[in-house]
């Protein structure tokens, strides 16, 4: 799996999970989230050569096409596979609200 | 939807469905498929700016992060959303075989 256990341990040009910490105020200009101040969002990036974690038959065919025709601009892309939610605390007036935002943290990647 | 009806009608730099016809013999070097000789595989490509068909909360956050921090290398990617199968005819010896290959044709795209 192209997850932290594999990707953060290996030097990898190919599609893999990359660490990304987002500070809500500094990086997004958000002041409305009280806690946490930021989170490990992570992201997916890297090349998708033949058979590198192909998600569908189309991505397998496309990576084969791209290998045989390297001048072609059509190739699969490295995107999130498994995502997890993030629990945040914010205020409406003086009333605290706890909310779980779905699909906020990338845990693994794939070529799609 | 970023499908043929929209994407093939509009000149679009952003994430959209792109036409791609794959000739099995010429483009993949395959002689084993008897029919069809090729097919409209299509592919997804283009930029994923803020709110352009974001697939998840993470991709929305990432596109916002990328807008505010344009020097960052983290951004969503344009990938297939809806896929359809392709029915092929091939031979094993002199015996014809019909098989449906799932997820071979891209019908629409998303930023993920």
């Amino acid at each position: 799996a192209l997850d932290a256990a594999y990707c953060f341990r290996n030097v990898q040009d190919n599609c893999c999970l990359r660490p990304l910490y987002i500070d809500f105020k500094r990086d997004l200009g958000w002041k409305w989230i009280h806690e946490p101040k930021g989170y490990n969002a992570n992201f997916c990036a890297g090349a998708c050569p033949y058979l590198w974690s192909s998600d569908t038959q189309h991505s397998r065919v496309l990576s084969l096409y791209n290998t045989i025709n390297p001048e072609a601009s059509a190739s699969p892309c490295c995107v999130s596979q498994d995502l997890e939610p993030l629990t945040i605390l914010y205020y409406i007036g003086k009333t605290p609200k706890i909310e779980q935002l779905s699909n906020m943290i990338v845990k693994s990647c794939k070529c799609s | 939807a970023l499908d043929a009806a929209y994407c093939f009608r509009n000149v679009q730099d952003n994430c959209c469905l792109r036409p791609l016809y794959i000739d099995f013999k010429r483009d993949l070097g395959w002689k084993w498929i008897h029919e069809p000789k090729g097919y409209n595989a299509n592919f997804c490509a283009g930029a994923c700016p803020y709110l352009w068909s974001s697939d998840t909360q993470h991709s929305r956050v990432l596109s916002l992060y990328n807008t505010i921090n344009p020097e960052a290398s983290a951004s969503p990617c344009c990938v297939s959303q809806d896929l359809e199968p392709l029915t092929i005819l091939y031979y094993i010896g002199k015996t014809p075989k019909i098989e449906q290959l799932s997820n071979m044709i891209v019908k629409s795209c998303k930023c993920s």
Epitope: Q57, R60 | K31, W32, I92
Partner: nanobody, 120 residues
Framework: QLQLVESGGGLVQPGGSLRLSCTAS???????????MAWFRQTPGKQRELVAL??????NYADSVKGRFTISRDNAKNTVYLQMNMLQPEDTAVYVC????????????WGQGTQVTVSS
């Protein structure tokens, strides 16, 4: 039971040659079409690299091996070969073969790998 068996690896001096073989056994390879055969190589701590690939009428090579390596296949023997000439120390790796078979979709099978060491 479907199996890929590689052979031909070993220790060779720089400038030397080796011929790797990968034979596919098991009924799957006799019953279903093969859509691609390929050789990859893996070195510790580095990513798996596609070395050479062949389909029915197309071949492709990594830039680093072009002009030195040749991939070929013998359909009757269900075997794919990798002829490696002018070997260099940077070619040292575990070489793994992969066979793509059309079996309820595009399925891929991996061998166990064979070690190639180029050293004087």
């Amino acid at each position: 039971q479907l199996q890929l068996v590689e052979s031909g690896g070993g220790l060779v001096q720089p400038g030397g040659s080796l011929r790797l073989s990968c034979t596919a056994s098991g009924s799957t390879f006799e019953i279903y079409p093969i859509y691609a055969m390929a050789w990859f190589r893996q070195t510790p701590g580095k990513q798996r690299e596609l070395v050479a690939l062949t389909t029915d009428v197309k071949t492709n090579y990594a830039d680093s091996v072009k002009g030195r390596f040749t991939i070929s296949r013998d359909n009757a023997k269900n075997t794919v070969y990798l002829q490696m000439n002018m070997l260099q120390p940077e070619d040292t790796a575990v070489y793994v073969c992969n066979v793509g078979v059309v079996r309820g979709g595009l399925q891929n099978y991996w061998g166990q790998g064979t070690q190639v060491t180029v050293s004087s």
